[in-house]
């Protein structure tokens, strides 16, 4: 079935990226994501969800995870870490399905 | 403001890949506000969703098209890119890109016609 | 996946008229992710209303947009010669995103 957008009260977080406005932001559930591009280190980024909650269910890969929760600054201490090297039978990317 | 341009064969083979590039102009990629889709239109008809990505690289693929659909991203370049592979003339269709926030779709690039035939 | 039928197929209005769209879905639809565009002939198609009612920017307010559930309805209140164009309703914000297969708006 697919993942209906929160219809919640807004829940304030921590945001922490190069987007951001202010040290928090306001949104339907709290993110962080990780994220690691070809040839560079690890990025994580905290901040705001509103759409695509399907993202949230996506298994780690080597380049990539998402973590949502839904309760005031719960995204504030998370650090997450990234899957070990796959197969080169699996492709990078999550596909939320 | 952002806009949104599409570019890449305007003929494919049947059999081959459909490969196009949507490159992103008076805006960040890596927003983690918008999503990037992949909208197509067959000739006369309505509109059919391909997929998105975000700037993380996570993506999610209409069923329908998801055992044919790639879609990757390149926030270096500003672009995210469609492959669609063994198509067939029922691939013939328009091809949009557009940027998703919590206000829908907007903007959409201008659209950009790729045939299958040999 | 959600299943969004738009009615009527086609609408004969004149200009100066008043024209009401409906948009159904096979389940419900959150109407915080509910959108409507515009379509013309060799365009790409064109934001009119997000969240279900509230107007992209640089809409006229004869575009209003209502609904909540499983109904949604665009309705444009004096009918203007460039308003002749196909309109699509579309479910986002979860997917797959859907669109309704149009609601072709034709001069009578």
């Known amino acids: 079935d697919p993942v209906k957008p929160s219809r919640g009260p807004l829940v304030t977080c921590t945001c922490e990226s190069p987007h951001c406005k202010g040290p928090t932001c306001r949104g339907a559930w709290c993110t962080v994501v990780l994220v690691r591009e070809e040839g560079r280190h690890p990025q994580e980024h905290r901040g705001c969800g509103n759409l695509h909650r399907e993202l949230c269910r996506g298994r780690p890969t080597e380049f990539v995870n998402h973590y949502c929760c839904d309760s005031h600054l719960c995204n504030h201490n998370v650090s997450l870490v990234l899957e070990a090297t796959q197969p080169p039978s699996e492709q990078p990317g999550t596909d939320g399905q | 403001q952002v806009q949104l341009q599409e570019s890449g064969p305007g003929l494919v083979k049947p059999s081959q890949t459909l490969s196009l590039t949507c490159t992103v102009s008076?805006?960040?990629?890596?927003?983690?506000?918008?999503?990037w889709n992949w909208i197509r239109q067959h000739p006369g008809k309505g509109l059919e969703w391909i997929g998105y990505?975000?700037?993380?690289?996570?993506?999610y693929y209409n069923p329908s098209l998801k055992s044919r659909v790639t879609i990757s991203v390149d926030t270096s370049k500003n672009q995210f890119s469609l492959k669609l592979s063994s198509v067939t003339a029922a691939d013939t269709a328009v091809y949009y890109c557009?940027?998703?926030?919590?206000?829908?779709?907007?903007?959409w690039g201008q659209g950009t016609l790729v045939t299958v035939s040999s | 996946e959600i299943v969004l039928t738009q009615s009527p197929g086609t609408l004969s209005l004149s200009p100066g008229e008043r024209a009401t769209l409906s948009c159904r879905a096979s389940?419900?639809?959150?109407?915080?992710?509910l959108a409507w565009y515009q379509q013309k002939p060799g365009q790409a198609p064109r934001l009119l209303i997000y969240?279900?009612?509230s107007r992209a920017t640089g809409i006229p307010d004869r575009f209003s947009g209502s609904g909540s559930g499983t109904d949604s309805t665009l309705t444009i209140s004096r009918l203007e010669p460039e308003d002749f164009a196909v309109y699509y309703c579309?479910?986002?914000?979860?997917?797959?995103?859907?669109f309704g297969q149009g609601t072709r708006l034709e001069i009578k």
């Open positions: 557009a940027r998703e926030d919590i206000a829908g779709f907007d903007p």
């Open positions: 008076g805006g960040s990629i890596s927003s983690g506000d918008y999503y």
């Open positions: 990505i975000y700037y993380s690289g996570s993506t």
């Open positions: 389940q419900s639809v959150s109407s915080s992710y």
């Open positions: 969240g279900a009612s």
């Open positions: 579309q479910q986002y914000g979860s997917s797959p995103i859907t």
